[in-house]
C-alpha cells in the first residue's frame, strides 16, 4: 500500500473500545474481527492525518471514520470529509486546522459499513501527537576565534518546541548530540579551524505545550569549515545542502555544486 503510516511510540491516554456482535466462544467470525488501529498525527498544527492499515482488513473495505471532541462544545459527531486512499480504498482521513482542537479529548471512530456493529473507538490527546516541520534557515555565526553559534527558525510553533542539535566533523564516525530548550540557538565553544563541521537540527512539541514523543524530520544540514570558512570567517550561512565554491577553488569558474560534488572536490 502506498499510504505512509507512522507508528507512534504510544499515547498512554489512548483507549480502544470495540463494539462487536456477540458470538459463540468457539467461533470467531468476520464480524468480530478487530478493526485496525487508527494512528493520528497533527502536522505543525496545520492539519491532521488519521490513518489506518487498510491491508489488515481481510478484503478491500472502505472503512468510514467519524470523530468528535469529548465533553466540549465540539461534541457533535462529524463525518470525515477528506479521505486518504490506498489502492482505491480508504486508509485515512485528513482534518484541517479549523477542525483541530489540541486541548480537548479527540474521539475517533472507525466503522465497517458492511458490518455496522463492527466499530472501534479511540480517545486521543492531540497535544501529544504534534509533529512540527523541520527547522529551517540554519545559519552559523562565529562569536570568537574558537566559538560558533548555530541559529534556526521553526514555523509558528517556536516557544512550544524543544530541539536536538547534532554535529560532527569529517573525521568523526558518529554525531555528537546536544539538547536545546525552546530557544533556537546553540553554541559550540571550541571549534577546530582545520576541520569541516556539519550541523543539523530537529524539533519536538514538548514539554511546554504538549508531551509529544515524535521528532520532526531533520533540517537540511549546514556546513562550516575547510576552505569556505577562510573566505568569510564571521558569517557563513548555507541552506539546502548546496555550497558556493569560490573562483580560486574551481580554477576561475564560479559554480553552484552539490554536497556530493563538494566531498569529491575536497578529498581529491
Amino acid at each position: 500500500l502506498n499510504t505512509t503510516i507512522l507508528t507512534p511510540n504510544g499515547n498512554e491516554d489512548a483507549t480502544t473500545d470495540f463494539f462487536l456482535t456477540s458470538m459463540p466462544t468457539d467461533s470467531l467470525s468476520v464480524s468480530t474481527l478487530p478493526l485496525p488501529e487508527v494512528q493520528c498525527f497533527v502536522f505543525n498544527v496545520e492539519y491532521m492525518n488519521c490513518t489506518w492499515n487498510s491491508s489488515s482488513e481481510p478484503q478491500p473495505t472502505n472503512l468510514t471514520l467519524h470523530y468528535w471532541y469529548k465533553n466540549s462544545d465540539n461534541d457533535k459527531v462529524q463525518k470525515c470529509s477528506h479521505y486518504l486512499f490506498s489502492e482505491e480504498i480508504t486508509s485515512g482521513c485528513q482534518l484541517q486546522k479549523k477542525e483541530i482542537h489540541l486541548y480537548q479529548t479527540f474521539v475517533v471512530q472507525l466503522q465497517d459499513p458492511r458490518e455496522p456493529r463492527r466499530q472501534a473507538t479511540q480517545m486521543l490527546k492531540l497535544q501529544n501527537l504534534v509533529i512540527p516541520w523541520a527547522p529551517e534557515n540554519l545559519t552559523l555565526r562565529k562569536l570568537s576565534e574558537s566559538q560558533l553559534e548555530l541559529n534556526w527558525n521553526n514555523r509558528f510553533l517556536n516557544h512550544c518546541l524543544e530541539h536536538l542539535v547534532q554535529y560532527r566533523t569529517d573525521w568523526d564516525h558518529s554525531w555528537t548530540e546536544q539538547s536545546v530548550d525552546y530557544r533556537h540557538k546553540f553554541s559550540l565553544p571550541s571549534v577546530d579551524g582545520q576541520k569541516r563541521y556539519t550541523f543539523r537540527v530537529r524539533s519536538r512539541f514538548n514539554p511546554l505545550c504538549g508531551s509529544a514523543q515524535h521528532w520532526s524530520e531533520w533540517s537540511h544540514p549546514i556546513h562550516w569549515g575547510s576552505n569556505s570558512s577562510k573566505e568569510n570567517p564571521f558569517l557563513f550561512a548555507l541552506e539546502a545542502e548546496q555550497k558556493l565554491i569560490s573562483e580560486e577553488d574551481l580554477g576561475g569558474e564560479q559554480k553552484l555544486i552539490s554536497e556530493e560534488d563538494l566531498h569529491h572536490h575536497h578529498h581529491h
Epitope: L1, L28, S29, V30, T32, L33, P34, S55, P58, Q59, P60, E87, E88
Partner: antibody, heavy 119, light 108 residues
Framework: QVQLVQSGAEVKKPGASVKVSCKAS????????MHWVRQAPGQGLEWMGW????????NYAKRFQGRVTMTRDTSITTAYMELIRLRSDDTAVYYC????????????WGRGTLVTVSS | EIVLTQSPGTLSLSPGERATLSCRAS???????LAWYQQKPGQAPRLLIY???SRATGIPDRFSGSGSGTDFTLTISRLEPEDFAVYYC?????????FGQGTKVEIK
C-alpha cells in the same frame, strides 16, 4: 527462506475427515492471512476460506461452511484445514496460500496436499 | 459472486510467438484487484501479475498485464519453452475470491 511446507498425501474413505497442515517459515506467521484453495484433478482453483493467524478469526466460502474448520498454532507457525464428512468429489489437491501483507493477492503457495476420497 | 471467464481454453503456439490470454468478469473488478497465476503440472500456482498490470518479484518482463473493468489481458511477448503452462486469473476485490477456469498454453 520464506516457504510454506504442507503435510503429505492422504487417502480417506467417504464420511471420514482429513486435517491438512501448513508450516510457515521465514516470515512473521501472525502478520499474514492464510487462505486455503483446492484443485480437483484436471480442474481449476477453488477458494475455500481464510484464517487470520494473529487472532484466529476465520471466514469460509459458503459451500464449505459447516464442513470446514481452519485453525492455527502460532507456537509452531502452522495453519490447519480440517474437512469433515468427506465425499468422493472432495478428492483434490489442497493448497495453503499466504496473502500479501500489502494487498489481497496470494504471493506464496504451499506445494499442495493430495487428498483422495475413495471407498 | 464474481464469475471470471477465461478464453481461449487452450492456446497452441510455438516458442518465440506472442500469447494473448483474456479474462472477462461478470461484474466490474477494480483493476487494483486482479491477479494472474501460472501453474505447471504437479506444481503450485505462482504469482505473475497483481493489480492487473504489476509484475511480481522475479517475473520476466515478457509477461505483462492490462485491462480494467470487466476485461483483462495477460500477454507473453515471446514465448519461452518454460512458459508452456496453465494460466489463471483471479479477482481479490470481494469475497468470495474467485478464479477463472484457466487457459492452457501448449506447444504447437
Amino acid at each position: 527462506q520464506v516457504q510454506l511446507v504442507q503435510s503429505g498425501a492422504e487417502v480417506k474413505k467417504p464420511g471420514a475427515s482429513v486435517k491438512v497442515s501448513c508450516k510457515a517459515s521465514g516470515y512473521t506467521f501472525t502478520g499474514h492471512y492464510m487462505h486455503w484453495v483446492r484443485q480437483a484433478p484436471g480442474q481449476g482453483l477453488e477458494w475455500m476460506g481464510w484464517i487470520y493467524p494473529h487472532s484466529g478469526h476465520t471466514n469460509y466460502a459458503k459451500r464449505f461452511q459447516g464442513r470446514v474448520t481452519m485453525t492455527r498454532d502460532t507456537s509452531i507457525t502452522t495453519a490447519y484445514m480440517e474437512l469433515i464428512r468427506l465425499r468422493s468429489d472432495d478428492t483434490a489437491v489442497y493448497y495453503c496460500a499466504r496473502r500479501s501483507g500489502r494487498s489481497w493477492y496470494f504471493d506464496l503457495w504451499g506445494r499442495g496436499t493430495l487428498v483422495t476420497v475413495s471407498s | 459472486e464474481i464469475v471470471l471467464t477465461q478464453s481461449p481454453g487452450t492456446l497452441s503456439l510455438s516458442p518465440g510467438e506472442r500469447a494473448t490470454l483474456s479474462c472477462r468478469a461478470s461484474q466490474s473488478v477494480s483493476s487494483s484487484y486482479l491477479a494472474w497465476y501460472q501453474q505447471k503440472p504437479g506444481q503450485a500456482p505462482r504469482l505473475l501479475i497483481y493489480g492487473a498490470s504489476s509484475r511480481a518479484t522475479g517475473i520476466p518482463d515478457r509477461f505483462s498485464g492490462s485491462g480494467s473493468g470487466t476485461d483483462f489481458t495477460l500477454t507473453i511477448s515471446r514465448l519461452e519453452p518454460e512458459d508452456f503452462a496453465v494460466y489463471y486469473c483471479q479477482q481479490y476485490g470481494s469475497s468470495p475470491w474467485t478464479f477463472g477456469q484457466g487457459t492452457k498454453v501448449e506447444i504447437k
